[in-house]
């Protein structure tokens, strides 16, 4: 015999106590499949959480972080301060990147200059706090006399944290 | 030499999902960025998003977050790229790319992979 | 996002002709600009990278050149195999972002 519940759609749910019926999920709540006993709970934006997509009746509210603020784990669980390009976020707040290390974005952590010579290449632009450096051709391919290394590119707004 | 090498070809229904792989051989897979780009048909080049495998951070474009997820695997050297919820207008060559010696452009190119959404 | 504005998107040219392409981000990006070859099979390269470096094995007819937000990929002397289509990239903000494209055939 078929189960009667699974004619149920998406945003309602099989109420036993009304014999089975599929009745609306509740207000505050959803049901994203078809075939529910139950209707789930939406999730709240509160406090350092902002909405970012409303709670229907199938489908569950999505947050975000209010601003000054970045996402972590998975459907944006927690929230985390954002530091300045050149910096990490760290127990006691956010620090200045170290010297041979930079971070061009609002968060994420101080990563390593490229080391262009691993690659066969020379330095073409020097390394920030907030830049990486830009490798260039392998030395071999400067001509003599040319200057290889470029003064580094004033920072703005991120790439991403290369190498 | 670098090489970059993906998946083959795949068709796939809407709504179904598809995972894309990349696969890096000649250089240290830990040490360059693999970036995604979406070419749709007739279309120019669209940036999807990177990830450093050598911690798995990941950059995403706005425009891509609820749609792909970029993973790696440090073991086999590969990346990966997984839609979901497919729909017609995910039909497009995905290309994975290395990046360059921190200059952000892409020095490395797999030969693209051909997905098409179709009922 | 950074706004990549291409042109021309087309251009055909004889063998020999001196070919330019410009490519204008919506704002600064210092010299953070790329440029790619598309070939009809769907190959890409990258040719110069960092506004005006060419890249190890790129002919030298390529040249590129700019700041800012206004630069310029030059072909010095068409040549047959040049029939691509070019791209430019900004590479200083995230998502990066592609020019539309300029497609290139040979008169």
């Known amino acids: 015999l078929q189960d009667p519940c699974s004619n149920c759609p998406a945003g309602t749910f099989c109420d036993n106590n009304r014999n089975q019926i599929c009745s609306p999920c509740p207000p505050n709540s959803f049901s994203s499949a078809g075939g529910q006993r139950t209707c789930d709970i939406c999730r709240q934006c509160k406090g350092v959480f902002r909405t970012r997509k409303e709670c229907s009746s199938t489908s569950n509210a999505e947050c975000d972080c209010t601003p000054g603020f970045h996402c972590l784990g998975a459907g944006c669980s927690m929230c985390e301060q954002d530091c300045k390009q050149g910096q990490e976020l760290t127990k006691k707040g956010c620090k200045d990147c170290c010297f041979g290390t930079f971070n061009d974005q609002k968060r994420g952590i101080c990563r390593p200059w490229t080391n262009c010579s691993l690659d066969g290449k020379s330095v073409l632009v020097n390394g920030t706090k907030e830049r990486d450096v830009v490798c260039g051709p392998s030395p071999a391919d400067l001509s003599p006399g040319a200057s290889s290394v470029t003064p580094p590119a004033p920072a703005r707004e991120p790439g991403h944290s290369p190498q | 030499q670098v090489q970059l090498v993906q998946s083959g070809a795949e068709v796939k229904k809407p709504g179904a999902s598809v995972k894309v792989s990349c696969k890096a051989s000649?250089?240290?897979?830990?040490?360059?960025?693999i970036n995604w780009v979406k070419q749709a048909p007739g279309q120019g080049l669209e940036w999807i998003g990177n990830?450093?495998?050598?911690?798995?951070?990941?950059n995403y474009n706005q425009k891509f977050k609820d749609k792909a997820t970029i993973t790696a695997d440090k073991s086999t050297s590969t990346a990966y790229m997984e839609l979901s919820s497919l729909r017609s207008e995910d039909t497009a060559v995905y290309y994975c790319?290395?990046?360059?010696?921190?200059?952000?452009?892409?020095?490395?190119w797999g030969q693209g992979t051909t997905v098409t959404v179709s009922s | 996002d950074i706004q990549m504005t291409q042109s021309p998107s087309s251009l055909s040219a004889s063998v020999g002709d001196r070919v330019t392409i410009t490519c204008r981000p919506s704002q600064d990006i210092s010299n953070y600009l790329n440029w790619y070859q598309q070939k009809p099979g769907g190959t890409v390269k990258l040719l110069i990278y960092?506004?005006?470096r060419l890249r190890s094995g790129v002919p030298s007819r390529f040249s590129g050149s700019g700041s800012g937000t206004d630069f310029t990929f030059t072909i010095s002397s068409l040549q047959p195999e040049d029939i691509a289509t070019y791209f430019c990239q900004q590479g200083d903000t995230l998502p990066y972002t592609f020019g539309q494209g300029t497609k290139l055939e040979i008169k």
């Open positions: 960092y506004t005006s």
């Open positions: 990830i450093y495998p050598s911690d798995s951070y990941t």
């Open positions: 790319t290395r990046d360059y010696g921190s200059s952000y452009s892409f020095d490395y």
């Open positions: 000649g250089y240290t897979f830990t040490s360059y960025w």
